[in-house]
């Protein structure tokens, strides 16, 4: 399960403080649940690890956009 994330409701309490290279990322999930203390992103890496990140950071937003474009381009 994601680093620093609760099981019952997926929340991020701590976020990674370093950039993950885009080529290591597979997908992401937005966390906006009201029961979570903050909005966050959970990135899933190609090795299957899940990591919380702060969407206010530029690299996080750029990575999300990159993944959006890849996902859309993979569609038939």
């Amino acid at each position: 399960q994601p680093d620093s994330v609760s099981i019952a409701i997926t929340c991020c309490f701590n976020v990674i403080n370093r950039k993950i290279p885009i080529q290591r990322l597979e997908s992401y999930t937005r966390i906006t649940n009201i029961q979570c203390p903050k909005e966050a992103v959970i990135f899933k890496t190609k090795r299957g690890k899940e990591v919380c990140a702060d969407p206010k950071e530029r690299w996080v937003r750029d990575s999300m956009k990159h993944l959006d474009q890849i996902f859309q381009n993979l569609k038939p």
Partner: antibody
Framework: QVQLVQSGAEVKKPGSSVKVSCKAS????????MHWVRQAPGQGLEWMGR????????KFDPKFQGRVTITADTSTSTAYMELSSLRSEDTAVYYC??????????WGQGTTVTVSS | DIQMTQSPSSLSASVGDRVTITCKAT??????LAWYQQKPGKAPKLLIS???SLETGVPSRFSGSGSGTDYTLTISSLQPEDFATYYC?????????FGGGTKVEIK
């Protein structure tokens, strides 16, 4: 739970300014972005701009650039939107909303601003 | 700026009807689309984000679909409380823009 409570209705003269407040509870505003959206009578929704309360960084629709100021006070969990050089077309309901991703999951109740001579 | 064109601007329907509202962007928005419901005198309520993700507490009769520039909101069986105005909004790039709205009225 999250609540965004806005200041009361305002009646303003053309050429003047208005400042609307939005007090948040149930969340730390420095963790999110606070946006302002307006809606003229019988019209659709129009995004004006947003602030990152953690550092004061703002982004605006170019249509409002130079006429709108968005500020935030993290000590009181309050965001503010000031619109200057008011004209009759600025008569609208002004909403604050939160959302770091660019969509808005919690909204204030709205503040009616009427611009009339 | 990305323009959002919503259609129809209004529609009349009966309770139990299936209702479809469409939204077209002037460029690819990569599923960064939200749908809102607004009732008179009230703030908008977020229904769907990311084109398809239903918000917590939103009834399952609401669904979103689409990709690229074309997106759809469907209400599978219209209920009395669903009569309202619906807006789409792109959040791919600022300035964030809304569609013109679709007013769903009682037939």
């Amino acid at each position: 739970q999250v609540q965004l409570v806005q200041s009361g209705a305002e009646v303003k003269k053309p050429g003047s300014s208005v400042k609307v407040s939005c007090k948040a509870s149930g969340l730390t505003i420095s963790d999110t972005y606070m946006h302002w959206v307006r809606q003229a009578p019988g019209q659709g929704l129009e995004w004006m701009g947003r602030i990152d309360p953690a550092n004061g960084n703002t982004k605006f629709d170019p249509k409002f650039q130079g006429r709108v100021t968005i500020t935030a006070d993290t000590s009181t969990s309050t965001a503010y939107m000031e619109l200057s050089s008011l004209r009759s077309e600025d008569t609208a309901v002004y909403y604050c909303a939160r959302g770091v991703f660019g969509f808005f999951d919690y909204w204030g109740q709205g503040t009616t601003v009427t611009v009339s001579s | 700026d990305i323009q959002m064109t919503q259609s129809p601007s209004s529609l009349s329907a009966s309770v139990g009807d299936r209702v479809t509202i469409t939204c077209k962007a002037t460029e690819d928005i990569y599923n960064r689309l939200a749908w809102y419901q607004q009732k008179p005198g009230k703030a908008p309520k977020l229904l769907i984000s990311g084109a398809t993700s239903l918000e917590t507490g939103v009834p399952s009769r609401f669904s979103g679909s689409g990709s690229g520039t074309d997106y759809t909101l469907t209400i599978s069986s219209l209920q009395p409380e669903d009569f309202a105005t619906y807006y789409c909004q792109q959040f791919w790039s600022a300035p964030y823009t809304f569609g013109g709205g679709t007013k769903v009225e009682i037939k």
